[in-house]
């Protein structure tokens, strides 16, 4: 088999026939050095998954439940291409499973026990697996058989396809539980009708069901969605209030050596030639000898799944939780109203050691999880491997785009009411050596630059955003002669000045000596022409305040700030000479952990915060000898956000817009992945 062949897995005679037709038609339109198709027939989707894992086949299209199976060890497959529905301009690759209720009914998600429920059908995704999976640990024990537990949880249900003899309560609202449209309450529209008719109190359907059944907005306004955080939202706010976001139909491949680029090349060319309304001879999204063969008949095309996206991220935390609960049937011992330990995400060894010290001192309230980069940490929080971390504003933006929420803000100024008063922010500045007297904001081209890290506020987003507005391109590595911007591509000139050894060179963590505020300033001291840092960095590392050999003899007077008007000012005049105001660093978490992270961190800062006077004899949460480990070292307290509890509100319109403008220059693979899930 030539190297450019994609072996497609078919699960029936009809699929195999369509696959052969696909193969032959692709041969006729693609040059001989292009991708080609070979067909492999297996008895089931699970057999296809195993065949791909064993390198006997390369690709198959699966629905969400099977994507989960494909991801599990030992299969370890990943999503590579998604089918989309709707239009090319507004492609839909996901649907949302929602819980719909009548507006005046007054109960929340955590009050569903004893209510009457309407389901699309037993074992179906939006109508059963997702809601029951998410409610699983609230079901009365024993939870097996599942149908009995569900029947005892709700006061009555319509769950088409259930066994009405063994579980009559599941058929109470639709006598007979018929498994077809003969049952008026079957399927999406049926489950909604069950709610509309007043038979049930809640319907588990997908987001489009309400719009398909109620064309009139005034009618839709009689209904609301139940959100997982025990609030309600209007039915058109399903993106912010759903049980799970579910991919419709996805091509999977091996995680390693999976030919994902080749599969995309093949499918992209296939949709060009044989997609919707392209060819009479062969149609990719049509199944004359059956239904949904190889691909869904309703699909309009394909989109490449970003490479950073693994199956867990693609399926989303809620969906994975629901399916795992159903499959594994395990629930925590602890009562659900008690907070479990918060799993803090620590970057590299230095942070992990401090985190472990915190964990020991916290007496079981804090646990630690390690990752190599901030983006890896954010991904771990998204999928539940970790719960929280404190982030620079640039990463609060990425975390927010990935569905995380800010929960507390670092405050840097001493005040009587620190915890109740989140600050306006700190200043992003450009520092130069006083001796380089000809250097100004207007002649930085060709100079050597020092950055905290790519994607961070003071070190990257603000200065590079301003620079982008001037030069109108993203080739910052050509603008500066060389520099250190940890997180840049290793062969970039913006890694040339970095000091990390071996694989640690230019890594965006403390293994790179020029990482972070202190690192960027050190880079200026030792090699660079300009450092992009925060206004406190110079005073914190001069006048003997940093005992490290490189810093101990430094004098603040030897450094100056570059102002945007082309002038320079002394370091202490940052208020009149800065690049922009930056939002303070903030702790982020998943929505479901928000309350517990808030509660535990407030307890922890009362024990180990700034009120601890002797850090040599006690653990201090906000100290790490100028290394900013876990939190910035100048943190005075973690402050409540009040109503600034989304990333947009926290960061502010101006900063969100600035980072949005820089998006075209973004190298963040995580941001790309998250905007795929939520454009």
């Amino acid at each position: 088999v030539p190297d450019k062949t994609v072996r497609w897995c078919a699960v029936s005679e009809h699929e195999a026939t369509k696959c052969q037709s696909f193969r032959d038609h692709m041969k006729s339109v693609i040059p001989s050095d292009g991708p080609s198709v070979a067909c492999v027939k297996k008895a089931s989707y699970l057999d296809c998954i195993r065949a791909i894992a064993a390198n006997e086949a390369d690709a198959v299209t699966l629905d969400a439940g099977l994507v989960y199976d494909a991801y599990l060890a030992p299969n370890n497959l990943k999503p590579v291409v998604a089918e989309f529905y709707g239009s090319k301009e507004d492609p839909q690759t996901f649907y949302y499973a929602v819980a719909v209720v009548k507006k005046d009914s007054g109960f929340q998600m955590n009050q569903l026990r004893g209510k009457k429920s309407c389901h699309t059908g037993l074992g179906r995704s939006a109508g059963w697996n997702i809601p029951i999976g998410l409610l699983y640990c609230d079901l009365p024990e024993p939870r097996k058989p599942l149908e009995k537990a569900v029947a005892n949880f709700f006061s009555g249900s319509c769950a088409p396809c259930a066994d009405g003899t063994d579980f009559p309560q599941l058929c109470q609202l639709c006598p007979g539980c018929g498994c077809s449209t003969l049952n008026q309450y079957f399927g999406y529209s049926g489950a909604f009708k069950c709610l509309k008719d007043g038979a049930g109190d809640v319907a588990f359907v997908k987001h489009s069901t309400i719009f398909e059944n109620l064309a009139n907005k005034a009618d839709r306004d009689q209904y609301e969605l139940l959100c997982l955080d025990n609030t309600r939202k209007p039915v058109d706010e399903y993106k912010d209030c759903h049980l799970a976001q579910v991919p419709s139909h996805t091509v999977v491949a091996r995680s390693m050596g999976g030919k994902e680029d080749l599969i995309w090349e093949l499918l992209n060319q296939a949709q060009e030639h044989f997609g919707k309304d392209k060819s009479k001879e062969f149609q990719l999204f049509s199944s004359p000898h059956g239904k949904d063969l190889l691909f869904k008949d309703s699909a309009h095309g394909f989109l490449k799944v970003p490479p950073r996206m693994d199956a867990k991220m693609y399926l989303g935390y809620e969906y994975v939780t629901a399916i795992r609960n159903l499959r594994e049937g395990t629930c925590p011992e602890a009562p659900t109203d008690e907070c479990k330990p918060v799993k803090w995400c620590a970057l590299s060894h230095h942070e992990r050691l401090k985190c472990d010290e915190w964990s020991v001192n916290s007496v079981g309230k804090i646990e630690c999880v390690s990752a190599e980069t901030t983006e890896d940490c954010i991904a771990k929080i998204m999928n539940g491997e970790a719960d929280a971390m404190s982030l620079d504003g640039g990463f609060v933006y990425i975390a927010g785009k990935c569905g995380l929420v800010p929960v507390l803000a670092e405050n840097y100024n001493k005040s009587d009411n620190c915890e109740d008063t989140p600050e306006a922010g700190y200043f992003a500045i450009a520092v130069v050596k006083k001796s380089a007297s000809d250097l100004t904001w207007d002649n930085l081209k060709g100079k050597k630059s020092c950055h905290t890290a790519v994607g961070r506020t003071a070190g990257w987003n603000i200065p590079m955003g301003l620079l982008y507005n001037k030069i109108n391109h993203c080739r910052f590595d050509e603008f500066f002669s060389e520099g250190c911007a940890p997180g840049s591509k290793k062969d970039s000139s913006l890694c040339k000045l970095c000091m990390g050894s071996g694989l640690n060179l230019c890594e965006p963590n403390n293994k790179e000596g020029y990482y972070g505020y202190t690192g960027a300033f050190r880079c200026l001291v030792e090699k660079g022409d300009v450092a992009f840092v925060k206004h406190q960095t110079v005073p914190q590392n001069t006048g003997g305040k940093n005992p490290d050999p490189w810093a101990k003899n430094l004098n603040e007077k030897d450094y100056e700030l570059l102002c945007l008007d082309g002038t320079r000012k002394p370091v202490e005049e940052y208020a009149n000479c800065h690049l922009a105001r930056a939002p303070n660093h903030a702790v982020v978490t998943r929505k479901d952990k928000e309350a517990c992270v808030h509660k535990i961190l407030r307890q922890q800062q009362h024990l180990f915060g700034s009120n601890v006077t002797d850090c040599s004899g006690n653990f201090c949460l906000f100290r790490s000898e100028t290394k900013d480990l876990l939190f910035r070292d100048d943190t005075v307290c973690l402050a409540k956000l009040h109503d600034r509890n989304t990333y947009e509100k926290y960061l502010g319109e101006e900063y969100v817009k600035a980072v949005g403008n820089l998006r075209k220059c973004s190298t963040s693979s995580l941001l790309e992945a998250c905007t795929f899930r939520r454009p």
Partner: nanobody
Framework: QVKLEESGGGLVQAGGSLRLSCVAS????????VIWYRQAPGKQRELVAL???????NYRESVKGRFTISRDDAKNTVWLQMNALEPEDTGVYYC??????FGQGTPVTVSS
Amino acid sequence: QVKLEESGGGLVQAGGSLRLSCVASGSGFGINGVIWYRQAPGKQRELVALIKSDGYTNYRESVKGRFTISRDDAKNTVWLQMNALEPEDTGVYYCKTPGVPFGQGTPVTVSS
């Protein structure tokens, strides 16, 4: 009230070994983990190694591969085995567990 007592320190040549022990009087010792710190003359106290109740261990970068922390709950003791000692390891070594004040420490001097 739990009290901690460190012992095992002394004068040793570079490359040599020492085994420090931390013994607790009283019950509930180390339920949440035990940390060894050290303080060199004129320097801040720094974490050397820690061991949690589940046996998880971690070390500061400069001692990794040379020092080993271990525990024996039956004996209410935590040890720090120090091999390939370097002059930079000189200092007073303390063990600590949450809620219990620092003990006297045990001095370690590594001569070159």
